[in-house]
Structures are given as structure tokens and as C-alpha cells.
Interface confidence: medium
């Protein structure tokens, strides 16, 4: 268990041309607030998917009224941190979405109007218990500066908040199975905390964050009875005699999500997946149009100007998500063939090909020997994306341009002497040996272990290796 903390430092116009106009005016004073959504892992989920690690809303910032003629300054921010408590282990890698909302305080009928001013998203690695990490994110012409950290709530410790410590009951020892919890010398590890929401009656755990079901129960939180033959309905009758139980009311019962949003249960409560054009914890906030600049990373916004019409972001290559907020890892599709190295340059995909292959995706197998000459009578041999020369006798090297020393490998056996020859090498054998490499002993009676020596060569003569 622990808390993710987000500190917003500034929200204002980013550097460069095209400074945004102030979101507030004398006629329409407003104030800002922020929403953070956290998801575990380096999530590629859509922006609308549940904030499985949790979400938080900031307080409202001070009321701001634009000074006529002045450029948009950094806008006044709400006090305090945004805190997202997590009950289970801190995942180490997480995805975040930080939304900047504007609350207009003019004379609206029905109270203040909310609209999304900017949304930034990212994926990060973060160990719990570490220092504050600083970040800058840009959304259109706006720039958001913030810091974040994850810290464990006692008794949890460690980079994932999974080591659970509690004060020792005695100075000398811990309880059964409770090891001393370094570096806290006076503490001991404590019982595991199961996955948040794990039924205390029907579930248990032997690892932090897990939820194992007792017999007769199922579901991720062990709240669903295993149906038996005596259960007539899918959820089972509410009768003690049948052994079937109706789970208690779920957080999504009655669907708390407005405007057609769909509800999904989370360990904490529920999460609404909102249709395009609606936001908020219960999809109660509408009014995002192309005028609000909801498309990031150069996405093209298409949609009507009235608040009720949905907008669509057409994303440039390399980005996806309903607001083009997520970079696509196009290399994960392994587009480069034949072992080519994939490089995602943002604006384009590049394949760096291995030798012997070419083409945008390294799809062409080059003729390795085309245009490759092997010198001194060598012949080119193709293979494995690289050419190789089979050199004529007396030559070596990649292209057969180097004259070889045939005697370098000491080819003559039994003390024979090697002589380089224009056509190869010649071995002068020591007495008692014969053969091209002096490899055969001469028998005492003058016969050899080989067939008779070729005509013109007596045993003991130098043998030329052709």
C-alpha cells in the first residue's frame, strides 16, 4: 500500500510561437483544476480505459481573470498535492494521464461549466520510495510542469511497497515467519495484504496482492459463488439451504455512469468509460469540441462546433488514441525482415539492414557476388548475406589479393622440410618417410604403405603437393 503524489508546478503557454489565448476573461472568469489517471504497466490502452491504479481530482485553483492586452501568463494553481492511494503493490512502470480542466464562473444557467483545457499522457518507470521526479509535458500550445513520486504507507516498504513491516512485539525476535525487516532494525515483516477488495470471507492470499478463492467461490475477488445444480439463476437464489449466495450489491449496480458511459468495477469502486465528448468521474462533463484543441501531437480535429457533436482526432503517423496522445511503438510489429534493425524516428520508420539485404524493410536478398570480383583466379561463393571468395592455390584473403605462404601451417610431417612453389608447396621428406606431406613411413624392405610410387619418383624424393 502507498500513495502516488503529483505536484503541479506550473501550467501556462509553452515556448515558441502561437501562444494560446488566455482561457479566462473579465467577462468569463475561471479557475483551473487537475485530474490524474494512473494505469499499471506501460499501458497501450485507450485513454478512456479504467484508471486501474487510481485517479484523483485536485481542489479548484484561485479564480483568475485575464488582464486586457496581457499575454496568457502561467495560470494560478490549486494548493496541495494530488494524491492517488494504491492498495496493492506499486507496479514500477505506470502510465499517466493528467488533464487540466477549466471551470467557468460566468453567469451560466445551471452552475459552472467545465471544459477540458489540455491533456497530457506518458509512460514512466518509477520505484517507490525514491525522490521526486520532475517532468515537462506539452499539449498543443500549453506546457505543464510537474513532479511526482510514489511512497509507501507504513508498514509497507521497498521499491514496490510489498515488504510489509510492523513494530516488533519483542526486541529480540519477530513472530513466526516474520523476518526482521531491514533496514528498519526494530521492525518485522507483517502479514500479507491481499489484493484490494479480495473477499475477507471467501478469499485469501499467500503473496502480497493476490486473491485466492476458498472452495465454492470464484471471481477475481472471490465474491462469486461457484454455481451448483441447486442454483436456478446465474447468481443463485438467496437461500441458506441451497449453498448458493447472492453477492452483495456491486459498485456498478444501477450504472452510475451518465451519458451512455459503461461501468466497470475496480478494486476501489468503479470506473466509467465515457463515450466521446463526455468526461468526468461519471461521464457527467460534456462540451469538449475542436475549439478546445483536444487532439495532441499534430492530430487533426474533425467535428462540429456545438458542444453536443462529438469530435474525432485524425492522428499523424506514429500516434494513436482518441486524442492522439499515445506514441505507437511501430517497431513492436517487427516490420524489418531478415534480421534488420528497426528504428522508429517518429516521423518515419527506418530499417537498418544486415549485409546482403536491402529495401525499405530489408526484404530484398542481394546477389552477394554481383559486382564482386575475386582476384587471381578465385571464384565467388554466395551465402548468408555475405560473399566469400574461394581462392586459387597460393592466394588468400577476402578477395584473394593476398599471396599465401603455403608453408606457414607447417604442412610437412615427420620433420619434412617445406618449400614454397609457384603451384603450391613441396615437402622434402626426412629419411624413412614419403608422401605429399611425408605422412607415410617407408617399410624396411623398401616397400611403402602406399601403392607403388608414381613413375619417375623414387621413395624418399621430395613429393610435390599439387
Amino acid at each position: 500500500a502507498g500513495v502516488f503524489e503529483l505536484q503541479i508546478h506550473s501550467f501556462g503557454p509553452g515556448p515558441g510561437p502561437g501562444a494560446p489565448r488566455s482561457p479566462c476573461s473579465a467577462r468569463l472568469p475561471c479557475r483551473l483544476f487537475f485530474r490524474v489517471c494512473l494505469k499499471p504497466g506501460l499501458s497501450e490502452e485507450a485513454a478512456e480505459s479504467p484508471c486501474a491504479l487510481g485517479a484523483a481530482l485536485s481542489a479548484r485553483g484561485p479564480v483568475y481573470t485575464e488582464q486586457p492586452g496581457a499575454p496568457a501568463p502561467d495560470l494560478p494553481l490549486p494548493d496541495g498535492l494530488l494524491q492517488v492511494p494504491f492498495r496493492d503493490a506499486w507496479p514500477g512502470t505506470f502510465s499517466f494521464i493528467i488533464e487540466t480542466w477549466r471551470e467557468e464562473l460566468g453567469d451560466q444557467i445551471g452552475g459552472p461549466a467545465w471544459s477540458l483545457l489540455a491533456r497530457v499522457a506518458g509512460r514512466r518507470r518509477l520505484a517507490a520510495g525514491g525522490p521526486w521526479a520532475r517532468d515537462i509535458q506539452r499539449a498543443g500550445a500549453w506546457e505543464l510542469r510537474f513532479s511526482y513520486r510514489a511512497r509507501c504507507e507504513p508498514p509497507a516498504v521497498g521499491t514496490a511497497c510489498t515488504r510489509l513491516c510492523r513494530p516488533r512485539s519483542a526486541p529480540s525476535r519477530c513472530g513466526p515467519g516474520l523476518r526482521p525487516c531491514a533496514p528498519l532494525e526494530d521492525e518485522c515483516e507483517a502479514p500479507l495484504v491481499c489484493r484490494a477488495g479480495c473477499s475477507p470471507e471467501h478469499g485469501f492470499c499467500e503473496q502480497p496482492g493476490e486473491c485466492r478463492c476458498l472452495e465454492g467461490w470464484t471471481g477475481p475477488l472471490c465474491t462469486v459463488p461457484v454455481s451448483t445444480s441447486s442454483c436456478l439463476s446465474p447468481r443463485g437464489p438467496s437461500s441458506a439451504t441451497t449453498g448458493c449466495l447472492v453477492p452483495g450489491p456491486g459498485p456498478c449496480d444501477g450504472n452510475p455512469c451518465a451519458n451512455g458511459g459503461s461501468c466497470s468495477e475496480t478494486p476501489r469502486s468503479f470506473e466509467c468509460t465515457c463515450p466521446r465528448g463526455f468526461y468526468g468521474l461519471r461521464c457527467e462533463v460534456s462540451g469538449v469540441t475542436c475549439a478546445d484543441g483536444p487532439c495532441f501531437n499534430g492530430g487533426l480535429c474533425v467535428g462540429g462546433a456545438d458542444p453536443d457533436s462529438a469530435y474525432i482526432c485524425h492522428c499523424p503517423p506514429g500516434f494513436q488514441g482518441s486524442n492522439c496522445e499515445k506514441r505507437v511503438d511501430r517497431c513492436s510489429l517487427q516490420p524489418c525482415r531478415n534480421g534488420g534493425l528497426c528504428l522508429d524516428l517518429g516521423h518515419a520508420l527506418r530499417c537498418r539492414c544486415r549485409a546482403g539485404f536491402a529495401g525499405p524493410r530489408c526484404e530484398h536478398d542481394l546477389d552477394d557476388c554481383a559486382g564482386r570480383a575475386c582476384a587471381n583466379g578465385g571464384t565467388c561463393v554466395e551465402g548468408g548475406g555475405a560473399h566469400r571468395c574461394s581462392c586459387a592455390l597460393g592466394f588468400g584473403g577476402r578477395d584473394c589479393r593476398e599471396r599465401a605462404d603455403p608453408c606457414a601451417a607447417r604442412p610437412c610431417a615427420h620433420g619434412g622440410r617445406c618449400y614454397a612453389h609457384f603451384s603450391g608447396l613441396v615437402c622434402a621428406c626426412a629419411p624413412g618417410y614419403m608422401g605429399a606431406r611425408c605422412e607415410f613411413p617407408v617399410h624396411p624392405d623398401g616397400a611403402s604403405a602406399l601403392p607403388a610410387a608414381p613413375p619417375g619418383l623414387r621413395p624418399g624424393d621430395p613429393q610435390r603437393y599439387l
Epitope: A1, E153, P154, P155, A156, L164, R166, S169, G175, P176, G177, L178, A190, P191, L192, V193, C194, P200, G203, F204, C205, E206, R212, L214, E215
Partner: antibody, heavy 120, light 112 residues
Framework: EVQLVESGGGLVKPGGSLKLSCAAS????????MSWVRQTPEKRLEWVAA????????YYPDTVKDRFTISRDNAKNTLYLQMSSLRSEDTALYYC?????????????WGQGTSVTVSS | NIMMTQSPSSLAVSAGEKVTMSCKSS????????????LAWYQQKPGQSPKLLIY???TRESGVPDRFTGSGSGTDFTLTISSVQAEDLAVYYC????????FGGGTKLEIK
């Protein structure tokens, strides 16, 4: 129906050894932590040893540490307690008990017990 | 180890009466990370093994009559029998399972 049947108890001299067994049935034995709990002649209950579901972790109070060893054979649905260097204060009725889940859960089923008497 | 102290050590009541018995722990058995009290109550009838009545200090085990109620938090706990029946004659033990495992000395309930 959950059933736990202990065996192996008896009379043993101080310093002697004894091995208790507990045959489990009526539930998925390999899913539950198990314990041995004893009841003294004065009717006091004392926890003796525990083991997690896969046998990878064992737990003992100081009174029996290094003398008693708990183990389990999930294939045979059997829990064991090897007792050595027995003392007169180990005389008790020994119960095999099932936890509701892991170690940090209440015991929900008990066997009928097997009697161990340590006397010279 | 956490010491568990039960009181009274014995009591005698008539059938139909309400009875309460106390269990105190030398340290808190409330675990802050999940806000659970690691305390159980057991009933042991003469010649029988203990039977689980209550766990997490107040959760009644399935099949246990609803006249049995557990309450309390931290170090002070109570088992209440709202209307004692003749079959409730037993010794009642409290048990903490947070740090090691220790039992109270028991409260013997007799029926007048």
C-alpha cells in the same frame, strides 16, 4: 465434508521421538495452510507449528523450534509432525487443524486429536 | 508473544439470558494495512474439538447461529450470546493470529 484424522500418538520417554500424521479429506488439501495445535491437560490451547499450502514455508513458536518439524505430502493429502527431544511439558492432545486460507487466517477445522504422553 | 486474557474464567447463566465474555490482548491485533483484527473465537464442547465461531473479530463463520456476535477492535474484544441455549454449554477461547498464534485461557459457560 472436511475430515482431519490424526494418528501416531502414544507414550514416549523424555528425550524420545514421535511422528504424528494427519489424513485430510473432503477438501483440496494442497490449497490450504495447515497447523498443529495442542491442548494441555489443563485445557490450555497452544499453537505448535504451521506450514503453508505448498510446504515452502514453515512456522514454529520458540517452545518447539529446533525440536519439532512440520511437513506435508500434498499427493497423499497428509500432514506430519516429527517431534524429537520430547519433554514432559509436551504432554498434550495434538490437533491437526486447517486454516481458512494462508497462514495469517483463522483455523476453521480441527481433527479429533491424538494423545501424546511424555513420561519416564 | 501477544498475551490473551479472557474474563471471566467461568460463568453460569440460565437459558434465554444474554451473556458477554471479554478477551484482551497485550498488544493490538488490528493490522493497519487492511484494517482487520486478527482475532477469532472458538467454542469447545465437552469431549469435542474446538469449533470456529467468529473470525476477523466480528465475521460469523457460516452455519454459526446469529445469536453469536463478535465485536471490538485493537486490544479489547467481546463475544456476545444474545439468548443462551442449553447446547451452548462449552468453553470459549479467543485466539489472535497476527503475531505468532496465541490463545486465551478460555471462559467456561455453564447453564443453570
Amino acid at each position: 465434508e472436511v475430515q482431519l484424522v490424526e494418528s501416531g500418538g502414544g507414550l514416549v520417554k523424555p528425550g524420545g521421538s514421535l511422528k504424528l500424521s494427519c489424513a485430510a479429506s473432503g477438501f483440496t488439501f494442497s490449497s490450504y495452510a495447515m497447523s498443529w495445535v495442542r491442548q494441555t491437560p489443563e485445557k490450555r490451547l497452544e499453537w505448535v507449528a504451521a506450514i503453508n499450502s505448498n510446504g515452502g514455508n514453515t512456522y514454529y513458536p520458540d517452545t518447539v523450534k529446533d525440536r519439532f518439524t512440520i511437513s506435508r505430502d500434498n499427493a497423499k493429502n497428509t500432514l506430519y509432525l516429527q517431534m524429537s527431544s520430547l519433554r514432559s511439558e509436551d504432554t498434550a492432545l495434538y490437533y491437526c487443524a486447517r486454516h481458512r486460507g494462508g497462514f495469517y487466517y483463522a483455523v476453521d477445522y480441527w481433527g479429533q486429536g491424538t494423545s501424546v504422553t511424555v513420561s519416564s | 508473544n501477544i498475551m490473551m486474557t479472557q474474563s471471566p474464567s467461568s460463568l453460569a447463566v440460565s437459558a434465554g439470558e444474554k451473556v458477554t465474555m471479554s478477551c484482551k490482548s497485550s498488544q493490538s491485533v488490528l493490522y493497519s494495512s487492511n484494517q482487520k483484527n486478527y482475532l477469532a473465537w472458538y467454542q469447545q464442547k465437552p469431549g469435542q474439538s474446538p469449533k470456529l465461531l467468529i473470525y476477523w473479530a466480528s465475521t460469523r463463520e457460516s452455519g454459526v447461529p446469529d445469536r453469536f456476535t463478535g465485536s471490538g477492535s485493537g486490544t479489547d474484544f467481546t463475544l456476545t450470546i444474545s439468548s443462551v441455549q442449553a447446547e451452548d454449554l462449552a468453553v470459549y477461547y479467543c485466539h489472535q493470529y497476527l503475531s505468532s498464534r496465541t490463545f486465551g485461557g478460555g471462559t467456561k459457560l455453564e447453564i443453570k
